[in-house]
């Protein structure tokens, strides 16, 4: 019996506006029909969470108003977006997954993806 | 700094119920599942429950599944575990324990000893 | 349910030796194993985590290895504060399960 695994891509490029989209999918031990997503963030062995959606199988995800992400699910596999990121956010971004019902209850964490964040350069002033 | 501090365990008769509660302070609550585990006199460490996040996914080992009730306050950042028709075989210390954002129990409280015993 | 087992139960070490514990699970587990370190009258203290890394603030001798079902916990050189016991703990799938303890005292 192999254990849950979770696939994310290792390196991502955020946009020039500040937009950083990757999928994370897993593999499941058995037939679950409410998964939550997390996102953490690690930086100098520091993990945070950025944000974080339970979603019932078949139905979309939903983070809160206030969060940073958005996302879409279709079966085993998250689209994930994360919006308003600068250079300074730049480190590894971790999706873990949660098996949370039926039980038994069950972990799978990915390697992480490594987004970078590049501030664009301020337009120059032009005179006409 | 992360603290969590248990309470309310006791001298208890056989058949009868108990409270414990865990206060927890220094960190987003809500975002951590809370476990109970405990250990009997001279013996390992045994998990009791898990209580996920909002309070609605819990999960109970099956030695006191239909006896014990795991639950939280989110507003007020506490932990609770309702003993009910206690054994002698509960006789232990227990313990809460937060998990990590990742895996593994990062802190856990210092301990409440519950005794059964007629 | 996973089952965990340890070996050896116990063990007695000279201060400066290297001591390795090791402790199996019943079913893959991937890398979701922990190690904790208890001293007697106090709660246990979280060591490693996911079978390999470093929890915060503890001392770098000791290292995690392992995944899928066999794991190790090595103390490279042991110290005075190093005796105590030393538990397992899969975080994988309910209900969550420790291993029976090994017991490090001093030879």
């Known amino acids: 019996c192999k254990a849950m695994h979770v696939a994310q891509p290792a390196v991502v490029l955020a946009s020039s506006r500040g937009i950083a989209s990757f999928v994370c999918e897993y593999a499941s031990p058995g037939k679950a029909t409410e998964v939550r997503v997390t996102v953490l963030r690690q930086a100098d062995s520091q993990v945070t969470e950025v944000c974080a959606a339970t979603y019932m199988m078949g139905n979309e995800l939903t983070f809160l108003d206030d969060s940073i992400c958005t996302g879409t699910s279709s079966g085993n596999q998250v689209n994930l977006t994360i919006q308003g990121l600068r250079a300074m956010d730049t480190g590894l971004y971790i999706c873990k997954v949660e098996l949370m019902y039926p039980p038994p209850y069950y972990l799978g964490i990915g390697n992480g993806t490594q987004i970078y964040v590049i501030d664009p350069e301020p337009c120059p002033d032009s005179d006409f | 700094q992360v603290q969590l501090v248990e309470s309310g365990g006791g001298v208890v008769q056989p058949g009868r119920s108990l409270r414990l509660s865990c206060a927890a302070s220094?960190?987003?609550?809500?975002?951590?599942?809370m476990h109970w585990v405990r250990q009997a006199p001279g013996k390992g460490l045994e998990w009791v429950a898990v209580?996920?996040?909002?309070?609605?996914?819990?999960y109970y080992a099956d030695s006191v599944r239909g006896r014990f009730t795991i639950s939280r306050d989110n507003s007020n950042n506490t932990l609770y575990l309702q003993l009910n028709s206690l054994r002698a075989e509960d006789t232990a210390v227990y313990y809460c324990?937060?998990?990590?954002?990742?895996?593994?129990?990062?802190?856990w409280g210092q301990g409440t000893l519950v005794t059964v015993s007629s | 349910d996973i089952q965990m087992t340890q070996s050896p139960s116990s063990l007695s070490a000279s201060v400066g030796d290297r001591v390795t514990i090791t402790c199996r699970a019943s079913?893959?587990?991937?890398?979701?194993l922990n190690w904790y370190q208890q001293k007697p009258g106090k709660a246990p203290k979280l060591l490693i985590y996911?079978?390999?890394s470093l929890q915060s603030g503890v001392p770098s001798r000791f290292s995690g290895s392992g995944s899928g079902t066999d794991f190790t916990l090595t103390i490279s050189s042991l110290q005075p504060e190093d005796f105590a016991t030393y538990y397992c703990?899969?975080?994988?799938?309910?209900?969550?399960?420790f291993g029976p303890g090994t017991k490090v005292d001093i030879k």
């Open positions: 324990a937060r998990n990590s954002l990742l895996t593994g129990w990062d802190y």
């Open positions: 220094g960190f987003t609550f809500s975002s951590h599942g």
């Open positions: 209580i996920w996040y909002d309070g609605i996914n819990k």
């Open positions: 079913q893959s587990i991937s890398s979701y």
């Open positions: 996911a079978a390999s």
């Open positions: 703990q899969q975080s994988y799938s309910t209900p969550f399960t």
